[in-house]
């Protein structure tokens, strides 16, 4: 069904990190132009990105009104410049998207080591809580807030003068990691939602180093034997 | 369903190297960690070391660091565990895990490696 | 590194038993602790992962408790099955380490 000078959108994609969230479709228009609806399970349809040229549509707006629910979108197609025009069934071509549940799927973005402290034999390492579009109460929420003990982080470190590297998790946003006095260290940390099947781990952040900004050195520690 | 595939056993002799495989299936092993566990006969466990698929990074038990290689195949979904300079001590069951982050989840069925002149 | 005391090494009991194993952890490991069944000739198997929660497939008579530094494997109601050795990992920093086992024998 459909008009002739119209062609079904596909391969309709969902691409979503840390919530922020983009369906993606083909083909390039060619006389045609699109419309996005985007529901819930038991929701009414939305419309967005009305007759755009564009194949991909930012729903953010609507997913982070509850992460947790999972949606379907569809993408309808008219003919370019007569949008009121519809298929020989009565209703414009569309085609439907994947169910998408934000809470489960979004990728977790790279993450960022904000800082390390180094006291004597123990470095603190610590993980930007990144912002999230998620919004409650007026006030955006970081990741933590969203997944809470869901959400893991794995530090991987080594010293900047070998290979052996060592493992550490936290579900926090920090680490406190032992180490030998006197050698510098390089870190790097990866974001894990552990009770997932699909998207559990981030790519790995930047390599921070000891010796450069980001770190601090505190001489007012003493260890046991300097005592 | 998840599945870890682990080579069959081995007889090696002292001082020698021996590399052993766990194929993985039911599950992307770059979403995962991997693992090698020791159990020397009528003993417990003890962690040999492990392996990020994702990106390449392994970490060892110092008691294992210089003489094990831990790498994975994600092309193949195999992770392999290269034992060298091999004395009667490593004899004993491997077994390959995976680590979903809460746990070592899945386990292999074993691979006896018995060191014999 | 991290050093895990599992006591008792061995116990008897009989069948319909309450059995606590205890894992001490040298330093705080926030709940990355984990507790395995394993049979003679077997792979472990996953009971409790992250502390407390049960894995799939295991019988509600195991439960985990504990954080911090002090875990603890109960197992409420003790079955013929249950008869085996019992270990708990930390996998919260490397080197992991494993508890020596608890081997649970008939009383």
């Known amino acids: 069904s459909g008009t002739t000078n119209t062609v079904a959108a596909y391969n309709l994609t969902w691409k979503s990190t840390n919530f922020k969230t983009i369906l993606e479709w083909e083909p390039k228009p060619v006389n045609q132009v699109y419309t996005v609806q985007i529901s819930t399970k038991s929701g009414d349809w939305k419309s967005k990105c009305f007759y755009t040229t564009d194949t991909e549509c930012d729903l953010t707006d609507e997913i982070v009104k509850d992460v947790k629910q999972t949606y379907l979108a569809r993408v309808f197609s008219y003919p370019a410049g007569n949008v009121e025009s519809t298929g020989s069934a009565g209703e414009p071509l569309y085609e439907n998207s994947p169910e998408f549940t934000p809470y489960l799927e979004t990728n977790l973005g790279q993450p960022t080591i904000q800082s390390f402290e180094q006291v004597g034999t123990k470095v603190n390492v610590t993980v930007e809580d990144e912002r999230t579009l998620v919004r409650r109460n007026n006030t955006f929420l970081s990741l933590r807030d969203v997944f809470g003990k869901d959400l893991i982080y794995t530090l991987y470190y080594w010293k900047s003068s070998s290979s052996g590297k060592k493992t550490a998790k936290t579900n926090t946003n920090e680490f406190l990691i032992d180490v030998d006095k006197g050698e510098n260290y390089c870190f790097s940390v990866q974001a894990v939602i552990p009770s997932r099947t699909v998207n559990r781990k981030s790519t790995d952040s930047p390599v921070e180093c000891m010796g450069q900004e980001k770190g601090e050195f505190r001489e007012d520690y003493k260890d046991d034997d300097d005592k | 369903q998840v599945q870890l595939l682990e080579s069959g056993a081995v007889l090696a002799r002292p001082g020698t190297s021996v590399k052993i495989s766990c194929k993985a299936s039911g599950f992307n092993i770059k979403d995962y960690y991997m693992h090698w566990v020791k159990q020397r006969p009528g003993q417990g466990l003890e962690w040999i070391g492990g392996?990020?698929?994702?990106?390449?990074?392994?970490m060892y038990d110092p008691k294992f660091q210089g003489r094990v290689t831990i790498t994975a195949d994600t092309s193949t979904s195999t992770v392999f565990m290269e034992l060298s300079s091999l004395r009667s001590e490593d004899t004993a069951v491997y077994y390959c895990?995976?680590?979903?982050?809460?746990?070592?989840?899945?386990w292999g069925q074993g691979t006896l490696v018995t060191v014999s002149s | 590194d991290i050093q895990m005391t599992q006591s008792p090494s061995s116990l008897s009991a009989s069948v319909g038993d309450r059995v606590t194993i205890t894992c001490k952890a040298s330093q705080d490991i926030k709940s990355f602790l984990s507790w395995y069944q394993q049979k003679p000739g077997k792979a472990p198997k996953l009971l409790i992962y992250y502390a407390t929660s049960l894995a799939d497939g295991v019988p509600s008579r195991f439960s985990g408790s504990g954080s911090g530094t002090d875990y603890t494997l109960t197992i409420s109601s003790l079955q013929p099955e249950d008869f085996a050795t019992y270990y708990c990992?930390?996998?919260?920093?490397?080197?992991?380490?494993f508890g020596g086992g608890t081997k649970v024998e008939i009383k």
């Open positions: 895990a995976r680590d979903s982050g809460y746990a070592m989840d899945y």
């Open positions: 392996n990020d698929p994702a990106n390449g990074h392994s």
């Open positions: 990992l930390q996998h919260g920093e490397s080197p992991y380490t």
